[in-house]
């Protein structure tokens, strides 16, 4: 029996599914103008060459136009993130046109077949945009394509095929398999729009990465390093998502890109900042919290256009849920040891006390190893805005807190049996806020008491004379 096919070719050939008893010729891609925030509302279907729906559904030619492009689907239905995004766009841009690109029949396939269909879908979107451009007042510069997973590469094709240049493409965790490392004409790239920004949330550094690892936009943002998203661990998923399985973990991490984008739309008062850095390891070490020379940017919808940059990798930490914003701090700590106990790897925690709130006990993550008699840089972050920092408390975790530390302590003892009392000297800590870019130096309350050992704590207050406090003869203040 006849099956639908459109200008892109026979749908039957692409589906490998039982044939339906249908006679009409139908395009395999539909454009649904979402005319209401209500997800149950059926909206209006637009098709090239038919102007009546544009009038009937009050398509605003001068407003921004968003095209939301879904990715590969195993269920063949629109997933729940879609109406969240539609609603958020309507909330933020009340006059905008929000169009959902429905390519479900071509996406509900084996992954490899769905990948092969992305070009065809991109072509359909480009044809729709070319037709809209024939209308008075419609500007391609007002078009923002938002593609999730495989949909990000569809957006890339659309931007590549359209006559002219689309204003913006946002790639939400663009798909990795079959796109990693390929030519720019066969994946999303900075050439596909005037501004291409990308969020990478599931880029495993080993094995098959669901999201693409390589940078593919003008700016490429890797929240939490682009791999392990808070709230998506196995234990979190079992408790809070339907089907507590590995596939739900994958979904959680992959889809986090969408939720970060939605967050940027609805929580304007809590914008998340990302910071340019060469890699995740350096960011985790707290080295990259600079906003000089456009080295930081808002993420998601609020990202500032940076066309001079290409494939600029940016990083940030986030909370486990909305609002995702955290407050980043760089700590520069000079650690000195009289014992030259080179193997000492202390487990340190810091508590920040601010004018608005106090932080929790924050671990100082040792990315490589602590250098003694040198300045060590750490990254810490808080979920609350602490306000102006007033003081801080440094704690060296005692022996009994964990088996790992017990083993560490034992190893340290074996390597230095003659010197069981381990001590570090820390006279001051320099703190820089990523969000405000303010720098403050904190000194020990009592300059004569700057030593800390396992199980002890050390208090720091704002130095009286700020940055100028330098003692040339002291071995403690050789700050980088």
């Amino acid at each position: 029996s006849p099956v639908p096919f459109g200008p892109e070719g026979r749908l039957e050939d692409k589906l490998h599914k039982p044939k339906a008893t249908q006679t009409e010729v139908k395009p395999s891609v539909r454009f649904n103008l979402r005319t209401s925030k209500d997800p149950e509302h059926e909206g209006c279907y637009l098709s090239v060459g038919h102007s009546q729906p544009l009038e009937d559904c009050s398509f605003n030619m001068t407003a921004k136009t968003f095209f939301i492009i879904h990715g590969w689907t195993m269920s063949g239905i629109f997933e729940n993130w879609l109406h969240k995004l539609v609603s958020a766009l309507h909330t933020r841009e009340k006059d905008a046109n929000v169009v959902v690109v429905d390519w479900l029949p071509l996406a509900h396939q084996l992954y490899t077949d769905a990948v092969n269909n992305t070009r065809v879908v991109g072509h359909s979107i480009a044809r729709m945009l070319d037709w809209l451009q024939e209308k008075d007042d419609f500007s391609l510069g007002n078009v923002h394509l938002i593609g999730y997973s495989l949909g990000a590469h569809v957006a890339g094709y659309a931007g590549n095929f359209v006559k002219g240049t689309v204003g913006r493409i946002t790639g939400l965790d663009p798909a990795g398999p079959m796109f990693e490392g390929v030519d720019i004409n066969r994946r999303l790239s900075p050439d596909d729009a005037d501004f291409v920004d990308v969020l990478h949330t599931y880029t495993l550094s080993f094995g098959l990465s669901i999201g693409i690892r390589m940078p593919v936009g003008h700016i490429d943002i890797y929240p939490n390093g682009g791999d392990f998203q808070p709230g998506c661990g196995f234990n979190d998923v079992i408790g809070s998502f339907a089907y507590g399985t590995i596939s739900e973990m994958v979904k959680c991490e992959h889809e986090r890109a969408v939720h970060l984008f939605v967050d940027s739309l609805v929580n304007q008062d809590k914008p998340s900042f990302a910071f340019q850095c060469t890699d995740s390891s350096r960011f985790k070490r707290g080295i990259c919290l600079s906003c000089r020379k456009n080295r930081c940017n808002n993420i998601g919808y609020n990202a500032k256009k940076m066309r001079k940059k290409r494939n600029s990798k940016m990083y940030l930490k986030t909370r486990a849920g909305m609002p995702f914003k955290v407050y980043h701090y760089q700590l520069k700590v000079h650690m000195f040891s009289y014992n030259n106990s080179g193997d000492t790897q202390p487990t340190l925690y810091i508590t920040l006390y601010g004018s608005n709130a106090d932080s929790q006990n924050l671990p100082l993550e040792i990315v490589e190893k602590i250098e003694l008699n040198a300045t060590n840089t750490f990254l810490v972050y808080t979920e609350e805005d602490l306000g102006d920092l007033l003081k801080m408390r440094l704690t060296w975790e005692g022996v009994a807190h964990s088996w790992y530390n017990l083993w560490n302590e034992f190893r340290n003892y074996l390597s230095q049996p003659s010197n069981p009392s381990r001590e570090l000297y820390i006279r001051r800590i320099r703190v820089k806020s990523g969000e405000t870019q303010r720098k403050v130096t904190f000194c020990t309350q009592d300059p004569t008491k700057s030593s800390i050992s396992p199980g002890q704590e050390l208090w720091f207050h704002k130095c009286q004379d700020g940055w100028k406090m330098k003692n040339k003869t002291s071995p403690f203040v050789n700050l980088a």
Epitope: K17, S28, P39, S75, I77, F78, N80, W81, F241, A242
Partner: antibody, heavy 120, light 112 residues
Framework: QIQLVQSGPELKKPGETVKISCKAS????????MNWVKQAPGKDLKWMGW????????TYADDFKGRFAFSLETSASTAYLQINNLKNEDTATYFC?????????????WGQGTTLTVSS | DIVLTQSPASLAVSLGQRATISCKAS??????????MNWYQQKPGQPPQLLIY???NLGSGIPARFSGSGSGTDFTLNIHPVEEEDAATYYC??????????FGGGTKLEIK
């Protein structure tokens, strides 16, 4: 107003085939997915699967793969459920129910049901 | 598959009193702040009718004496005050974005 009208009751013998229809009116047929739900006598509701009324692509629940087929006649705004090689355990009332593609997948309108009796 | 367990299997409530029906899911049906749990009423010889969608939203034309609550794995349908015409079987139904979609075993409500 929105209506889903199903075909009348069927009495069939084991091994035979039945085709139940569900005619939609009052809305654009292709803009909503169509589900099929089974209710055996005195039993609870069992979701059989759904069909994309635009593309014609069916999705079947695991228990309904093989002998069951969903199809469409879009020009007549009608969905069909065909059951091949009927068995006694297919005796039940079958409902069609629509859902919104863009929404939260609840079934807002139902057909009146078609009673199928399979008996030798 | 997500299994929905309804309790009680049947209950009898006096006219004007409150009827409470519970539905427990084997796994969470929440997604980003929304609960994908629905409730239907079915009278003998009739198709089910949507009462509540997304845990707490009233279906079109449904009287306000019906209300739904809950999140995660535990959901409740309340009817207050119960009326004569509410005698029926009530089903919960989960509609997360990863089928198969499933129904609970039903609760038969009798009016005393």
């Amino acid at each position: 107003q929105i209506q889903l009208v199903q075909s009348g009751p069927e009495l069939k013998k084991p091994g035979e085939t039945v085709k139940i229809s569900c005619k939609a009116s009052g809305y654009t047929f292709t803009n909503y997915g169509m589900n099929w739900v089974k209710q055996a006598p005195g039993k609870d509701l069992k979701w059989m699967g759904w069909i994309n009324t635009y593309s014609g692509v069916p999705t079947y629940a695991d228990d309904f793969k093989g002998r069951f087929a969903f199809s469409l006649e879009t020009s007549a705004s009608t969905a069909y459920l065909q059951i091949n090689n009927l068995k006694n355990e297919d005796t039940a009332t079958y409902f069609c129910a629509r859902f919104s593609y863009y929404g939260r997948h609840y079934f807002d309108y139902w057909g009146q049901g078609t009673t199928l009796t399979v008996s030798s | 598959d997500i299994v929905l367990t309804q309790s009680p299997a049947s209950l009898a409530v006096s006219l004007g009193q409150r009827a409470t029906i519970s539905c427990k899911a084997s796994q969470s049906v929440d997604y980003d702040g929304d609960s994908y749990m629905n409730w239907y009423q079915q009278k003998p010889g009739q198709p089910p009718q949507l009462l509540i969608y997304a845990a707490s939203n009233l279906g079109s034309g449904i009287p306000a004496r019906f209300s739904g609550s809950g999140s995660g794995t535990d959901f409740t349908l309340n009817i207050h005050p119960v009326e004569e015409e509410d005698a029926a079987t009530y089903y919960c139904h989960q509609s997360t974005d990863d089928p198969p979609w499933t129904f609970g075993g039903g609760t038969k409500l009798e009016i005393k």
